[in-house]
Amino acid sequence: DSEEDEEHTIITDTELPPLKLMHSFCAFKADDGPCKAIMKRFFFNIFTRQCEEFIYGGCEGNQNRFESLEECKKMCTRDNANRIIKTTLQQEKPDFCFLEEDPGICRGYITRYFYNNQTKQCERFKYGGCLGNMNNFETLEECKNICEDGPNGFQVDNYGTQLNAVNNSLTPQSTKVPSLFEFHGPSWCLTPADRGLCRANENRFYYNSVIGKCRPFKYSGCGGNENNFTSKQECLRACKKGFIQRISKGGLIKTKRKRKKQRVKIAYEEIFVKNM
């Protein structure tokens, strides 16, 4: 069950972008429900980041269930994480500019900005730190560049860059890791272990980006940050694969990562939702 295999994979810079979901239900595990029908349905797999087939029993279950692959992709995947977003020639805002501000389901509230389609301005809101949607920017300037109109009705910027899917920044954030390496995993993997504010002593794991390993720590039961996993395997799965070694002159990247063999029905752990 805990058997792991090591593999060498050739990937490009844009494989496995940090995960940020359009809808929180896309993070739900595939749920076949209690009934016994055999119905082919699709769900979004947060680990493979793809829509996949599963067998639905015909009743109950959850919202991460779609009649077709196309519907699943439409609701849960964002090809714009790996492509050029919009250009000024199109005179259009990205679709996510029209989404409602979404604090997500966590409670590590931080200041973010969203484009308010009613006021046509970027405005401040409090983001809980996980999930939510892409109408969520770290700075007012980023929000304005992407979603607000310029003085003559043009988009402010020409988005000839790729959108970083975890923090909506237009350029990858530099991280303080050795120069031979670059971190392309979720940004929270770079944060220190945070016990939080309560008094429990729960066994958890965090990713230590200095040594590139998952280490145990004691979690208080509330607060803290997202570098907090219930098992070492989850920690490795979420963070280790993001630490990639760059071949000296760019081009392809070779990474050595461990991947846990997955059962047919994946046992998800709620890696996004902190204890509240």
């Epitope: 509230y109 200041t111 308010n116 009613q118 006021t119 405005e123 401040r124 809101f125 770290e138």
Partner: antibody, heavy 118, light 112 residues
Framework: EVQLVESGGGLVKPGGSLRLSCAAS????????MNWVRQAPGKGLEWVST????????YYADSVEGRFTISRDNAKNSLYLQMNSLRAEDTAVYYC???????????WGQGTLVTVSS | DVVMTQTPLSLPVTLGQPASISCKSS???????????LNWLQQRPGQSPKRLIY???KLDSGVPDRFTGSGSGTDFTLKISRVEAEDVGVYYC?????????FGQGTKVEIK
């Protein structure tokens, strides 16, 4: 002129329920996040809840989480607070307040008094 | 939660004289965006709260310029250069940097 008018307050027994309303006028209601803030008699102010512009997402103070539900009807320019399992410590004047683009409360209503007593 | 502490809690003043209210927060109110979301409310007797100052020093429209806000980090001050009769009421500082929003206990300004 921005106006916020609360209603629905009154006397209720512990464990009871009450629904407060706030009628908004003088601004484009659906453009703004909205809040409820309360003030216990002779005490200071306490933030209670916030709802996003279109009403899909909400924030609550720990003291009311699971008991109070904030909602809005943008078609009616109205904000609501459904209060269940009321306690004596919920006795207060309840104000609705508008949230500006800085996520700060700018305009406040005149308040409605909720008294929880047996 | 961030604790906001106001002093004094009661401030008797003479008409035409200056008045000053202090507000201290238990942690810095400087947000990640470089702004400080410290605000002041005025609540006149029998009335609802009214925003006077936001972002430390910005006056709301219609607020007389005898009111000034200053400070940074954890220490803030509201000053009234010359108190007028209509300034009587309770003044609250509150912070919007950290969630949840929290308020000071209020300072009651009254005429001597």
């Amino acid at each position: 002129e921005v106006q916020l008018v609360e209603s629905g307050g009154g006397l209720v027994k512990p464990g009871g329920s009450l629904r407060l309303s706030c009628a908004a006028s003088g601004f484009t209601f659906h453009s703004y996040a909205m809040n409820w803030v309360r003030q216990a008699p002779g005490k200071g102010l306490e933030w209670v809840s916030t709802i996003t512009t279109r009403g899909s997402y909400t924030y609550y103070a720990d003291s009311v989480e699971g008991r109070f539900t904030i909602s809005r009807d943008n078609a009616k320019n109205s904000l609501y607070l459904q209060m269940n399992s009321l306690r004596a410590e919920d006795t207060a004047v309840y104000y609705c307040a508008r949230q500006d683009g800085n996520f700060l409360m700018d305009y406040w209503g005149q308040g409605t008094l909720v008294t929880v007593s047996s | 939660d961030v604790v906001m502490t106001q002093t004094p809690l009661s401030l008797p003043v003479t008409l035409g004289q200056p008045a000053s209210i202090s507000c201290k927060s238990s942690q810095s109110l400087l947000d990640v965006d470089g702004k400080t979301y410290l605000n002041w409310l005025q609540q006149r007797p029998g009335q609802s709260p009214k925003r006077l100052i936001y972002l430390v020093s910005k006056l709301d429209s219609g607020v007389p310029d005898r009111f000034t806000g200053s400070g940074s980090g954890t220490d803030f001050t509201l000053k009234i250069s010359r108190v007028e009769a209509e300034d009587v009421g309770v003044y609250y500082c509150w912070q919007g940097t950290h969630f949840p929003f929290t308020f000071g206990q209020g300072t009651k300004v009254e005429i001597k």
